[in-house]
């Protein structure tokens, strides 16, 4: 029961996290105009990963997409890539985790298979969450660097009389959404991994008895703890810890239920 609850909760937390990562990626407010210590402007600028917007005090908002690919800063491209990778991994993880849920019965799927899928999706959620956190953090670092550079430039020239006020940008709402969403996805992934461990004992104990009783160790150990086994063999007595040290290739080649983030 506790395993089912942990798995279900992990799924829900990851689902919320991935929805948040998608929302953050689509949001326009990654960076917003810093209004502190600035002349009172009637124009408010904010920027996202895909377009920049200007809201006038009249109420009109104008957004323009970044229609160039090569002209964009490498850091912005990197952030875009990290967020997209996070979304893709999360989406796959979600798909896998749906099939891995203990409360959902699909054909004659064994618990060992569900455990493997749970672990896979858990790992995918963890990586997805890390991608989102990394993406948001890279962008935040870029903002901080640019903020202090523009602050230094702001009061230079014309003996302190500023001819052109340089627009400074600070953290937008999307950064906080991204950090929280990435964290939730990460937590959800960890919960899925914990749930996967919880699925092991019943089967393992049963196998252990069978192993000692029969003495046919080879017949009851198709893969044992070998990392290379992956998901290739789904025999009834296969140990569910097989995927514990799985390689990256194996994780990607087999759809995992935890990749919904």
């Amino acid at each position: 029961m506790a395993v089912t609850a942990c798995q279900g909760l992990g799924f829900v937390v990851s689902l919320i996290g991935i929805a948040g990562i998608i929302a953050a990626t689509c949001m326009d407010q990654w960076s917003t105009q810093d209004l502190y210590n600035n002349p009172v402007t009637a124009v408010f600028n904010y920027q996202g990963l895909w377009r920049s917007c200007v809201r006038e005090s009249s109420g009109f908002t104008e957004c323009r997409g970044y229609f160039t690919l090569l002209g964009l800063p490498a850091m912005l491209q990197a952030v875009r890539a990290l967020m997209i990778v996070g979304i893709v991994l999360g989406a796959i993880g979600l798909l896998v985790s749906i099939f891995a849920l203990k409360c959902i019965r699909i054909g004659s799927m064994e618990d060992s298979a569900k455990a493997n899928m749970t672990l896979t999706s858990g790992i995918m959620f963890i990586v997805s969450g890390l991608c989102a956190i990394a993406g948001v953090s890279v962008f935040a670092n870029m903002l901080v660097t640019n903020f202090w550079m523009s602050t230094a430039n702001m009061y230079t020239g014309m003996g302190g009389m500023v001819q052109t006020v340089q627009t400074r940008y600070t953290f937008g709402a999307a950064l906080f959404v991204g950090w929280v969403a990435g964290g939730l996805t990460l937590i959800g992934g960890v919960m899925m991994c914990i749930a996967c461990r919880g699925l092991a004992p019943e089967e393992t104990n049963y196998k252990a008895v069978s192993y000692h009783a029969s003495g046919h160790s080879v017949a009851y150990k198709p893969g044992g703890f070998k990392a290379s086994t992956g998901f290739g063999s789904n025999t009834k007595n296969k140990k569910i810890y097989d995927g514990g040290a799985r390689t990256e290739d194996e994780v990607q080649s087999y759809p995992s239920k935890h990749d919904y983030v």
Partner: antibody
Framework: EVQLVESGGGLVQPGGSLKLSCAAS????????MSWVRQTPDKRLELVAT????????YYPDSVKGRFTISRDNAKNTLYLQMSSLKSEDTAMYYC???????????WGQGTLVTVSS | DIQITQSPSSLTVTAGEKVTMSCQSS????????????LTWYQQKPGQPPKLLMY???TRESGVPDRFAGSGSGTDFTLTISSVQAEDLAIYYC?????????FGSGTKLEIK
């Protein structure tokens, strides 16, 4: 056709109060920011107050801050300007204006004259 | 507050002539976010309220004849009337719409000979 009609102007003594109204029609009033702009006898134009579409944000220049209050009733399509502690330098033609692209005043009323004199 | 200086204060021209009036701001009115200049031009004919001519320095308001053209960027702006008509007799005001309190210039009075 956009129409803005001001009312409530008149002669008032220094230190007195007055409330101006602006009835709007011909557009979705609740979607636009609105302003009061005055024109002094020497033809100089000056922004008096601005309010956003839902009334949640207002702006006043230092010359009227604390004395004038802009408000709106979107249900009645009406803009208001409550003026108190009036001074002789507040004597002007007061226009109600609708904000548009580029924070410009796209439409103006015919104005209402406010004279502050003893 | 941002200072807006208009010149000349008045000018007299004959119908059909080209007219240029300028407007200077003490600070740049160019917004880096959308690369637009927040300067507006108005025309006020005698006994009437001001009428919007140009916004974003060079975008003509609908219904405004194309003989009116706005140009400039940053701190220096110009309103040009390519061929003045008798009905253009008015005072022309420029306004900063970037910084509050949206200061207006003192106006350029256009008179026709």
């Amino acid at each position: 056709e956009v129409q803005l009609v001001e009312s409530g102007g008149g002669l008032v003594q220094p230190g007195g109060s007055l409330k101006l109204s602006c009835a709007a029609s011909g557009f979705t009033f609740s979607s636009y920011g609105m302003s009061w702009v005055r024109q002094t006898p020497d033809k100089r134009l000056e922004l008096v107050a601005t309010i956003n579409s839902n009334g949640g944000s207002t702006y006043y220049p230092d010359s009227v801050k604390g004395r004038f209050t802009i408000s709106r009733d979107n249900a009645k399509n009406t803009l208001y300007l409550q003026m108190s502690s009036l001074k002789s330098e507040d004597t002007a033609m007061y226009y109600c204006a609708r904000l548009s692209y580029g924070n410009s005043f796209a439409n103006w009323g015919q104005g209402t004259l406010v004279t502050v004199s003893s | 507050d941002i200072q807006i200086t208009q010149s000349p204060s008045s000018l007299t021209v004959t119908a059909g002539e080209k007219v240029t009036m300028s407007c200077q701001s003490s600070q740049s009115l160019l917004n880096s976010g959308n690369h637009r200049n927040y300067l507006t031009w108005y025309q006020q004919k005698p006994g009437q309220p001001p009428k919007l001519l140009m916004y974003w320095a060079s975008t003509r308001e609908s219904g405004v004849p194309d003989r009116f053209a706005g140009s400039g960027s940053g701190t220096d702006f110009t309103l040009t009337i390519s061929s003045v008509q008798a009905e253009d007799l008015a005072i022309y005001y420029c306004q900063n719409t970037y910084y509050y309190p949206f200061t207006f210039g003192s106006g350029t009075k256009l008179e026709i000979k």
